[in-house]
């Protein structure tokens, strides 16, 4: 089935090369050999901030291939994975593992997707099947969301799902993911 073996239930994540060739040794693994940035929102009062807008979180850059059945994108797409705890922007490190990690003693802040973008992708298929054009939804930026004690466990679980790569079989969110084709693609199919 062509690329079927390449694709499993979790989308394969390929570290982006050339960003941080020597990541901090304590975090050297497949999921963290990526560029990390803070959200860049400067705090007014970095040590006693109450405003979510004054918090920032890590935006990890990942590249992955888009698949549709046995077909795979000709090129990988790059998107963000929102990761980790949120803290005052000024205290967050610019790269993973640099500096101390700040943990709030009060409300919990989670790093979740903020904005999304749609991208057209051309997929190549094995066995002479016509190429497929699809659209995918990619995370474009992350934000900190304040969780109070009133948030129940299911909502916490939800944040965990959003913070990770979309997995196969997860429940669809209100936002959606799409596909596209050109006329040549259809004509080739007939």
């Amino acid at each position: 089935q062509g690329w079927q073996a390449f694709k499993n239930d979790a989308t394969e994540i390929i570290p982006e090369l050339g960003e941080y060739p020597e990541p901090p040794p304590e975090l050297e693994n497949n999921k963290t050999m990526n560029r990390a940035e803070n959200g860049g929102r400067p705090p007014h009062h970095p040590f006693e901030t109450k405003d979510v807008s004054e918090y920032s979180c890590r935006e990890l850059h990942f590249t992955r291939y888009v698949t549709d059945g046995p077909c795979r994108s000709a090129k990988p797409v790059t998107e963000l994975v929102c990761s980790g705890q949120c803290g005052p922007a000024r205290l967050l490190p610019n790269a993973i593992g640099r500096g101390k990690w700040w943990r709030p003693s009060g409300p919990d802040f989670r790093c979740i997707p903020d904005r999304y973008r749609a991208q057209r992708v051309q997929l190549l298929c094995p066995g002479g099947e016509a190429p497929r054009a699809r659209k995918v939804r990619l995370v474009a930026s992350c934000k900190c969301k304040r969780l109070t004690r009133f948030h129940n466990q299911s909502e916490l679980k939800d944040f965990g799902t959003e913070a990770a790569r979309p997995q196969k079989g997860r429940k669809p969110r209100p936002r959606a993911r799409s596909a596209k084709a050109n006329q040549a693609e259809l004509e080739n199919a007939y």
């Epitope: 698949t67 497929r132 659209k135 079989g169 799409s178 259809l186």
Partner: antibody, heavy 122, light 107 residues
Framework: EVQLVQSGAEVKKPGASVKVSCKAS????????IHWVRQAPGQGLEWMGR????????TYVPKFQGRVTMTTDTSTSTAYMELRSLRSDDTAVYYC???????????????WGQGTLVTVSS | DIQLTQSPSFLSASVGDRVTITCSVS???????LHWYQQKPGKAPKLLIY???NLASGVPSRFSGSGSGTEFTLTISSLQPEDFATYYC????????FGQGTKLEIK
């Protein structure tokens, strides 16, 4: 809330044309493919094609090639399907639908318009 | 062109019954490309299951899907009054194709 609202029922004579509209709200139409599917009375669903509102690129089933034109007006978030040289067997409910983006590596139509009945009769 | 054939075309059942609808595909497709829709009279179709076995948002857990290659099934574990409708399988590779539909009626 995601919605696709279609224009009202039409009665046309054979040989005429019909243009059905589909107004999208609750999402950015440019991010999604819009599909058109029709259903003749008492029959099953028949895919006609789809359009990318972002660039106007469309895909038509060969059966409708030359008779159908799909367009969009992104300023009003509206998709259109025009079918020309109507015949009595074009009498059907015409649906617009959105292809969802949020299902991992799955591609399914997740929201549909309410349908527009087009009756072709002399 | 990939053809989808549903069986049975008509199905009579009672509330509480377990029912299974089969969708046969003319050539093997990936399970990620097979979806199921429910349609009630005078209404637009509604996405029920995507990618063979994944429930769409708001769909009750009594619905389930399975299969691979050329044989796929939709199962309703315990029929409820609101489940009487027409069900369509659909594949999306380079073209969209629907099965002819299975009308589920009250016995």
């Amino acid at each position: 809330e995601v919605q696709l609202v279609q224009s009202g029922a039409e009665v046309k004579k054979p040989g005429a044309s019909v243009k059905v509209s589909c107004k999208a709200s609750g999402f950015n139409i440019k991010d999604y493919y819009i599909h058109w599917v029709r259903q003749a009375p008492g029959q099953g669903l028949e895919w006609m094609g789809r359009i990318d509102p972002d660039n106007g690129e469309s895909t038509y089933v060969p059966k409708f090639q030359g008779r159908v034109t799909m367009t969009t007006d992104t300023s009003t978030s509206t998709a259109y399907m025009e079918l020309r040289s109507l015949r009595s067997d074009d009498t059907a409910v015409y649906y617009c639908a959105r292809e969802g983006l949020d299902y991992g590596d799955y591609y399914a139509v997740d929201y549909w318009g309410q349908g527009t009945l087009v009756t072709v009769s002399s | 062109d990939i053809q989808l054939t549903q069986s049975p075309s008509f199905l009579s059942a009672s509330v509480g019954d377990r029912v299974t609808i089969t969708c046969s595909v003319s050539s093997s497709i990936s399970s990620s490309n097979l979806h199921w829709y429910q349609q009630k009279p005078g209404k637009a179709p509604k996405l029920l299951i995507y990618g063979t076995s994944n429930l769409a948002s708001g769909v009750p857990s009594r619905f389930s899907g399975s299969g691979s290659g050329t044989e796929f099934t939709l199962t309703i574990s315990s029929l409820q009054p609101e489940d009487f409708a027409t069900y369509y399988c659909q594949q999306w590779t380079t073209t969209y194709t629907f099965g002819q539909g299975t009308k589920l009626e009250i016995k």
